[in-house]
């Protein structure tokens, strides 16, 4: 009579995480008497998956009734597969012995590979803001996918980026993998409304890529441009000087007026005008009583934006000879008020 053979017909089985995996095994003979066991891995470190004789294996069910007379089918099904279940499974026949059963013959093994979806990509930007024309880095991470083959693309406002570096870890075989990518983006003044997208394609996603996004508004600082001008006034002894603060982002802005280097008034921008590109404008004015001055006045608009070093713009207010002659000791009035841009 031919000696018993253990047949595992599938060299490999591939299932999606969460599914059940059926591992097939058949014997060619009922002899010798003894149980079968399933192991993951081979050698001394192998892991017992199922023992026909004893034990509790809640995720394992047998495909056919093992106690049935003349049964030769020892296939099993493992439920709720995770990437950690990947490996080579061996169906092993034992011969009844005393006191212990003795391993008699093993199947060739079935490699179980688990296909797992990548996690939603998380995109993070730089810790500090940068100004236009500078380059900032964005990172994208996703974890837990298998197999290793994966595609990652970067987009800015729908346009594909090319300046990025991607790593998939680990480099060798693993039950699941992670991807990490860093993209370099050159900022432009119009990027307040811009968005970077990290797009991941993997065979488990059925053609629907996963996307992670980051807004460049979190990464950009657009410094303001200043313009100081004198507005025409009806009153001969008053001058209206305005400071137009244009195209800045983010909102945080503090403005100080100085007359001949002395602080006249400090104000925090509140009611701002938003431009189409997402930057802001603001205007402040200073009413100067020219009667209070015997000499020309240098008016300075000084702006501190987003905690950065102050920038300033000065304007020389000429006091006419007539006003110089009729100058008085009256304390000048200065009024500061925000208003809409011209």
């Amino acid at each position: 009579e031919d000696e018993l053979q253990v047949i595992q017909p599938e060299k490999s089985v591939s299932v999606a995480a969460g599914e059940s995996a059926t591992l097939r095994c058949a014997m060619t003979s009922l002899i010798p008497v003894g149980p079968i066991m399933w192991f993951r891995g081979a050698g001394a470190g192998r892991e017992l998956i199922y023992n026909q004789k004893e034990g509790h294996f809640p995720r394992v069910t047998t495909v056919s009734e093992l106690t049935k007379r003349n049964n030769l089918d020892f296939s099993i099904s493992i439920s709720n597969i995770t990437p950690a279940d990947a490996g080579t499974y061996y169906c092993v026949k034992f011969r009844k012995g005393s006191p212990d059963d003795v391993e008699f013959k093993s199947g060739a093994g079935t490699e179980l590979s688990v296909r797992a979806k990548p996690s939603a990509p998380v995109v993070s930007g730089p810790a500090v803001r940068a100004t236009p024309e500078h380059t900032v880095s964005f990172t994208c991470e996703s974890h837990g996918f298998s197999p290793r083959d994966i595609t990652l693309k970067w987009f800015k406002n729908g346009n594909e980026l090319s300046d990025f570096q991607t790593n998939v870890d680990p480099a060798g075989d693993s039950v699941s993998y992670s991807i990490h990518s860093t993209a370099r983006v050159v900022l432009t003044r119009g990027d307040v409304h811009s968005q970077v997208i990290c797009e991941i394609a993997h065979i488990t996603l059925q053609g629907d890529p996963l996307r992670g996004t980051a807004n460049l508004s979190e990464a950009i600082r657009v410094p303001p441009t200043l313009e100081v001008t004198q507005q025409p006034m009806r009153a001969e002894n008053q001058a209206n000087v305005t400071c137009q603060v244009s195209n800045f982002y983010p909102r945080g802005l503090q403005l100080t007026w100085l007359e001949n280097g002395n602080v006249s008034r400090t104000e925090t921008a509140s009611t701002l005008i938003e431009n189409k590109d997402g930057t802001y404008n603001w205007m402040s004015w200073l009413l100067v009583n020219t009667c209070a001055h015997r000499d020309d006045v240098v008016l300075t608009c000084q702006v501190e934006h987003d905690g950065q070093q102050a920038v300033s713009k000065s304007y020389a207010l000429e006091i006419s000879a007539h006003q110089k002659e009729h100058g008085s000791d009256i304390t000048h009035e200065a009024a500061l008020a925000p208003t809409a841009p011209l």
């Epitope: 490999s12 999606a16 065979i203 488990t204 053609g207 629907d208």
Partner: antibody, heavy 118, light 109 residues
Framework: EVQLLESGGGLVQPGGSLRLSCAAS????????MSWVRQAPGKGLEWVSI????????YNADSLKGRFTISRDNSKNTLFLQMNSLRAEDTAVYYC???????????WGQGALVTVSS | QAVVTQESALTTSPGETVTLTCRSS?????????ANWVQEKPDHLFTGLIG???NRTPGVPARFSGSLIGDKAALTITGAQTEDEAIYFC?????????FGGGTKLTVL
Amino acid sequence: EVQLLESGGGLVQPGGSLRLSCAASGFTLSSYAMSWVRQAPGKGLEWVSISSGSGANTYNADSLKGRFTISRDNSKNTLFLQMNSLRAEDTAVYYCARLRFFDWFDYWGQGALVTVSS
Amino acid sequence: QAVVTQESALTTSPGETVTLTCRSSTGAVTTSNYANWVQEKPDHLFTGLIGGTNNRTPGVPARFSGSLIGDKAALTITGAQTEDEAIYFCALWYSNHWVFGGGTKLTVL
């Protein structure tokens, strides 16, 4: 049991339009990408189009130059192929096929014959 | 567009092992091409045998296996049977589209 059943084929004149349907049963359509593949008489297979599981993404053969549109109604478990500006060279048997993952054609329909002739 | 090339015809005997191959005009076939093998039997009956290079579709006999051999994808039938007589198509994925080979007519005599 997984089954794919194409319908809507027939004879159409050059320049005409036709809409093929593929009724899926035995599985949930939204969990799978689906594809159309065609076979001209006496020729090999030619890939036409893929619809992603959600239907939000499509992938099309460049050679068709936008004349064919793949779509799906996941609530009705049905895949469609809208074919416009048909030409004689579009005469073929059109098959819908399921992608087990995005990389694995596992089940195929029996095909629908489209004949473009005047 | 890439061209995928297969043997036009092969003949084998029952019980023999036969290997069908699939070559890409763009270079070596890799796992990223997700090689598929599809069987066509008379009356336009198509069955997906192998996907993703080496994954056998459930219900397909274990004698069918997929692999990469050198710079080509391969379908090996170990112990061919008369019912395996059919046309076998391979398909390769190129980033955003599939390309099918011309098919191999396998005769089992």
